[in-house]
């Protein structure tokens, strides 16, 4: 059931979230550009089948459509999705020296965004139980798989962030 009006979310929280989404989108775009320029891996759609075989998951945001937004469920899915991407980004570690700093910053910015969401849920008395462990993360058997995985993870993350941004912008409207 929909929980509480969107107006129960402070404007300052929503603006902070929108900032953070834009920051992570920038980090993700930088990672995609470097993967394209360095390894000519420029088209995630060409790697979809490989993504299935590597077991790279998607994070749902099914509780967040603007028509029937469930506040607790939506924030929880946002947090769970960010938690998932933290694990996926961790699995990419060692992707290449050139990409390391960009990946490092992306990883921390995703973690900080997850913190912002959780902090707000806690203040609203709807904090989810702490997730004790990550689910099974993809294992990359080769450098190519890790780089291709990087393209797919960055692409999935960007899609997740686009939806997140739309939802947050909708909530921020008076």
């Amino acid at each position: 059931t929909p929980l509480g009006p969107a107006s129960s979310l402070p404007q300052s929280f929503l603006l902070k979230c929108l900032e953070q989404v834009r920051k992570i989108q920038g980090d993700g775009a930088a990672l995609q550009e470097k993967l394209c320029a360095t390894y000519k891996l420029c088209h995630p759609e060409e790697l979809v089948l490989l993504g299935h075989s590597l077991g790279i998951p998607w994070a749902p945001l099914s509780s967040c459509p603007s028509q029937a937004l469930q506040l607790a469920g939506c924030l929880s899915q946002l947090h769970s999705g960010l938690f998932l991407y933290q694990g996926l980004l961790q699995a990419l570690e060692g992707i290449s020296p050139e990409l390391g700093p960009t990946l490092d910053t992306l990883q921390l910015d995703v973690a900080d965004f997850a913190t912002t969401i959780w902090q707000q849920m806690e203040e609203l008395g709807m904090a989810p139980a702490l997730q004790p462990t990550q689910g099974a993360m993809p294992a990359f058997a080769s450098a190519f798989q890790r780089r291709a995985g990087g393209v797919l993870v960055a692409s999935h993350l960007q899609s997740f962030l686009e939806v997140s941004y739309r939802v947050l912008r909708h909530l921020a409207q008076p």
Partner: antibody, heavy 119, light 112 residues
């Protein structure tokens, strides 16, 4: 209220290792990253790295990547920083500081732990 | 790594007078999201650093409004409109645009 309490001063010989602890209270420990920063005598601040306790992921400043190890124990809300192969230049005050975004970043610091490396 | 450079390194000030500290970054800290990822910290004698300013121009909680900060993408200024005795210490600018986070060398403010 948020508090970060660090372990006491240490004196170590060159080549040895040191492990500094930072016990957090007043907030949900796994949710926030914990950063480590050091300050050599009369010098500025230098970022060592951070740990994300929720997934056990640590990231390091390239300068410390081979010698620093950051860990966290969520059951005791304690973060640890271990530095190996100590040399005299590692003599410094080591701080833990809670991460976050915007006005949350380094809004809370431990009191610092002085590590002296001397033969 | 982004290099942060502060000036002056020492700043003697008479109480009640204004003070100004400069900080320059080797790369623009202005992100495409419109936020400038520049912070100021103050370390009072014998204490841990404390947050003064976040995202270039925002005062942290509890910071007196005699402090202000402004700048462009690479050049920043921390101003104290009227220095008080409790303002003594070392002021550090820092960037958190990207890892590794980096700090300026510090500016020691002392009372004349």
């Amino acid at each position: 209220q948020v508090q970060l309490v660090q372990s006491g001063a240490e004196v170590k010989k060159p080549g040895a290792s040191v492990k500094v602890s930072c016990k957090a209270s007043g907030y949900t420990f796994p949710i926030y990253t914990m950063h480590w920063i050091r300050q050599a005598p009369g010098q500025g601040l230098e970022w060592i790295g951070y740990i994300n306790p929720s997934i056990g992921y640590a990231n390091y400043n390239q300068k410390f990547r081979d010698r620093a190890t950051l860990t966290a124990d969520t059951s005791t809300s304690t973060a640890y920083m271990e530095l190996s192969s100590l040399r005299s230049e590692d003599t410094a005050v080591y701080y833990c500081a809670r991460g976050g975004y915007g006005d949350s970043l380094f809004a809370y610091w431990g009191q610092g732990t002085l590590v002296t490396v001397s033969s | 790594d982004i290099v942060m450079t502060q000036s002056p390194l020492s700043l003697p000030v008479t109480p009640g007078e204004p003070a100004s500290i400069s900080c320059r970054s080797s790369k623009s800290l202005l992100h495409s999201n419109g936020i400038t990822y520049l912070y100021w910290y103050l370390q009072k004698p014998g204490q841990s650093p404390q947050l003064l300013i976040y995202q270039m121009s925002n005062l942290a909680s509890g910071v007196p409004d005699r402090f202000s900060s402004s700048g462009s993408g690479t050049d920043f200024t921390l101003k104290i409109s009227r220095v008080e005795a409790e303002d003594v210490g070392v002021y550090y600018c820092a960037q958190n645009l990207e890892l590794p986070y980096t700090f300026g060398q510090g500016t020691k403010l002392e009372i004349k």
